[in-house]
């Protein structure tokens, strides 16, 4: 038997993916475990294999269909179970009745690119991925810029309270290397959280012209 405290957390990406993390103190390392999804009103069910992400936590992605298909709604309830093999049978280790639109975490923004760069300014754009059409343009973003000699945690957060998929960074230092990240969040859902940060975009401001400041 497996003793210790267990935590089972899942998020819906608003389209066709439920990502889950299960952590268990004192869990058996060699046990094969999976997450099983049983919707209350759909004809499909889905399973994914839990893979270790640290000493005592495992993660997997339930792929419900094509990436941009709308597989769940606000009235769906999905019973999610962690099942671990014990000899010839499966044991239920954790269970939850999951309301997808109360537990949203969108995919990280993608396709970050520098639209235009100057000595003190840089215009950057991005795209959102696999976000439900239900949200329309009602999303918010947070962005941060990594300056030389600082850490990401020290970077001030810039908040965009609308679906604005670009930003103009100002008061930058000429001829300096920066990195930029952005994340997204819908308005809906009691337990909804920010998406992961995007992959960082590296860029360099232009050098100041000799004898003048631009």
């Amino acid at each position: 038997a497996v003793n210790g405290t267990s935590q089972f957390t899942c998020f819906y990406n608003s389209r066709a993916n439920i990502s889950c993390v299960w952590s268990q103190d004192g869990a058996l390392q060699d046990t094969s475990c999976q997450v099983h999804a049983w919707p209350d009103r759909r004809r499909w069910n889905q399973t994914c294999e839990l893979l270790p992400v640290s000493q005592a936590s495992w993660a997997c992605n339930l792929i419900l269909g094509a990436p941009d298909s709308q597989k769940l709604t606000t009235v769906d309830i999905v019973t999610l179970r962690v099942l671990c093999r014990e000899g010839v049978r499966w044991r239920v280790m954790a269970i939850q009745d999951f309301k997808p639109f109360e537990n949203l975490r969108l995919m990280a923004p993608i396709s970050l690119q520098v639209v235009h760069v100057e000595t003190h300014r840089c215009n950057i754009s991005w795209e959102i991925s696999q976000a439900s059409h239900y949200f329309e343009r009602h999303l918010e973003f947070e962005a941060r810029t990594l300056s030389p000699g600082h850490t990401w945690e020290e970077a001030p957060l810039l908040t965009l309270k609308q679906k604005q998929e670009w930003i103009c960074l100002e008061t930058l230092t000429p001829d300096t290397q920066y990195e930029f990240q952005v994340r997204v969040k819908p308005l809906q859902g009691e337990f909804t959280t920010w998406s992961p940060w995007s992959q960082p975009l590296a860029f360099r401001t232009k050098p100041a012209a000799l004898g003048k400041d631009t």
Epitope: Q70, T73, F101, Y134, H138
Partner: nanobody
Framework: QVQLQESGGGLVQTGGSLRLSCAVS????????MGWYRQVPGKQRELVAD???????KYADSVKGRFSILRDSVKNTVYLQMSSLKPEDTGIYYC?????????????WGQGTQVTVSS
């Protein structure tokens, strides 16, 4: 402002049929589920049938095989075809729509339409 307009209720004999309809109109919205609930005196409102995006219908056990729900997402209208009606189907039938407005989901209700099944 969102409005739900129900119609089709009335008095019918046991074994008869009725067709309820409910149209949603008003400000810009996206509907992800529409359905019917009924209330009888002294009892809580209970689900009769609803249909969510992706065509997944849910029915109360007491109406399975007798009632069918149809949703027209283009017209934002939901229909309830009721046949083989019984006296216990009597009640006020309410339309409910789950709507997305400005990035948030809310439930909206109609005023209700009376269905009376006489024996």
């Amino acid at each position: 402002q969102v409005q739900l307009q129900e119609s089709g209720g009335g008095l019918v004999q046991t074994g008869g049929s009725l067709r309820l309809s409910c149209a949603v109109s008003g400000s810009r919205f996206i509907s992800d589920v529409m359905g019917w609930y009924r209330q009888v005196p002294g009892k809580q409102r209970e689900l009769v049938a609803d249909m969510a995006d992706g065509g997944s219908a849910k029915y109360a056990d007491s109406v399975k095989g007798r009632f069918s729900i149809l949703r027209d997402s283009v017209k934002n209208t939901v229909y309830l075809q009721m046949s083989s009606l019984k006296p216990e189907d009597t009640g006020i039938y309410y339309c409910k729509a789950g709507l997305w407005l400005a990035g948030r989901h809310s439930d909206y209700w109609g005023q209700g339409t009376q269905v009376t099944v006489s024996s």
